[in-house]
């Protein structure tokens, strides 16, 4: 069920217990570029938002360009994904406890709006990678992720033949692709215009209520 392994009682307006997150969400006027939609209420700091826009940022030493230069149209989705991960205070219903050296909690099965996943896949399927799960299996001996020996660089489409394969497989099911569309109030938007407020607040409220009913 949705609430299996759910230890938290506070599901709304919360920050995850992870590497760079604030312990409490709040305004951050100077959030950088693609993270700016969260400036009214964020779990990330301005410096985190700045750092995550860099190639091989110090946050995780993760190199998007592990198979040659990632297309800018593709990279922007990974930056947005990282903004959502670091900054969103509206993912409480999907927080799970984990036993990892670098974080105590993670997101699991966040219902990502189907168009956000589709567009991510469309913009990335001709960029190159060497792995279908980016959480594990890298060669970290240099301090930066490199393709493990024998893992061939191929198009994203080779490793992620469908949008769901990308969005769900990439980060070990942090996301699941929702059947709902953007603006429905039933799925999390990676992209939104903050002038209209943060649509993910309503989504979190809906799923938090559903969890309390179960």
């Amino acid at each position: 069920t949705m609430c299996s392994a759910q230890d938290r009682t506070d599901l709304l307006n919360v920050c995850m217990d992870a590497k760079h997150h604030k312990t409490k969400p709040g305004p951050e006027d100077k959030l950088h570029d693609q993270c700016s939609p969260w400036k009214k209420n964020a779990c990330c700091t301005a410096s985190t938002s700045q750092e995550l826009h860099k190639d091989t940022s110090r946050l995780y030493n993760f190199n998007w360009d592990h198979c040659g230069k990632m297309e800018p149209a593709c990279k922007r989705h990974f930056i947005q994904d990282t903004c959502l991960y670091e900054c969103s205070p509206n993912l409480g219903p999907w927080i799970q406890q984990v036993n990892q050296s670098w974080r105590k909690e993670r997101f699991l099965d966040v219902p990502l709006c189907k168009e956000d996943c589709q567009r991510w896949w469309e913009d990335c399927h001709t960029s190159h990678t060497c792995k279908s799960n980016w959480h594990r299996g890298w060669d970290w001996t240099s301090g930066v992720n490199k393709c493990p020996a024998g893992a061939l660089c191929r198009t994203f489409e080779s490793y992620f033949p469908t949008p769901a394969a990308l969005c769900e497989g990439l980060w070990s099911h942090s996301y699941k692709v929702s059947n709902y569309s953007r603006g429905s109030g039933r799925c999390i938007q990676m992209w939104f215009d903050s002038a209209q407020g943060n649509p993910n607040e309503e989504v979190a409220r809906f799923y938090a209520a559903a969890m309390h009913v179960n």
């Epitope: 040659g68 399927h125 190159h128 020996a149 024998g150 061939l152 198009t155 489409e157």
Partner: antibody, heavy 118, light 106 residues
Framework: EVQLVQSGAEVKKPGASVKVSCKAS????????MHWVRQAPGQRLEWMGW????????KYSQKFQGRVTITRDTSASTAYMELSSLRSEDTAVYYC???????????WGQGTLVTVSS | ELTQDPAVSVALGQTVRITCQGD??????ANWYQQKPGQAPVLVIY???NRPSGIPDRFSGSSSGNTASLTITGAQAADEADYYC???????????FGGGTKLTVL
């Protein structure tokens, strides 16, 4: 800029062997598979086999199994294709090609003409 | 084995479709190459209708069942060439090429 530069033309006698080289530059050599494809005069392209440049694993076409050997030297970013027991019908242009998606070859060498004649 | 029509012609500016048939295409995408005399092949379409950079958008690919198609919309004189399809053969990760189609632009 990705480039694949092949060795020069060869003339061989029937029964001999030939070894064609393909030097890669402009990308991480060990991250991609390299395939070999040949084309006899006026004929179709014919796939011969491939090598995983990272770990050296190879796959060969049934037609060439036992006669072809594909190797690589990672320090020189170079792939090699050796064909033995040559016969006149092996006269062809031999190409190396980088694989980006199970048979999608985005960069090709300029080709090496191998002529087998007594 | 992949089967192609040996020759196809098209009037300048018109649309032409080149087909490729074979069992491997039921479970694998076709890739398409353009080859001009004395030159190495050039990848024009791969995977699910992807064009490498530098390939004009008049080239497109599609597939249905065991048949893949390359469509050139508004053929130009520069498109006159041989066109080859290829496909992965899932068993053994082998690759097979079609026999090629000679395109003439009239």
């Amino acid at each position: 800029e990705v480039q694949l530069v092949q060795s020069g033309a060869e003339v061989k006698k029937p029964g001999a062997s030939v070894k064609v080289s393909c030097k890669a530059s402009g990308y991480t050599f060990t991250s991609y598979a390299m395939h070999w494809v040949r084309q006899a005069p006026g004929q179709r392209l014919e796939w011969m086999g491939w090598i995983n440049a990272g770990n050296g694993n190879t796959k060969y076409s049934q037609k060439f199994q036992g006669r072809v050997t594909i190797t690589r030297d990672t320090s020189a970013s170079t792939a090699y294709m050796e064909l033995s027991s040559l016969r006149s019908e092996d006269t062809a242009v031999y190409y190396c090609a980088r694989d980006i998606s199970y048979g999608s070859f985005d960069y090709w060498g300029q080709g090496t003409l191998v002529t087998v004649s007594s | 084995e992949l089967t192609q029509d040996p020759a196809v012609s098209v009037a300048l500016g018109q649309t032409v479709r080149i087909t490729c048939q074979g069992d491997s295409l039921r479970s694998n995408y076709a890739n398409w190459y353009q080859q001009k005399p004395g030159q190495a092949p050039v990848l024009v379409i791969y995977g699910q209708n992807n064009r490498p950079s530098g390939i004009p958008d008049r080239f497109s690919g599609s597939s249905s069942g065991n048949t893949a198609s390359l469509t050139i919309t508004g053929a130009q004189a520069a498109d006159e060439a041989d066109y080859y399809c290829d496909s992965r053969v899932s068993t053994g990760n082998h690759v097979v090429f079609g026999g090629g189609t000679k395109l003439t632009v009239l």
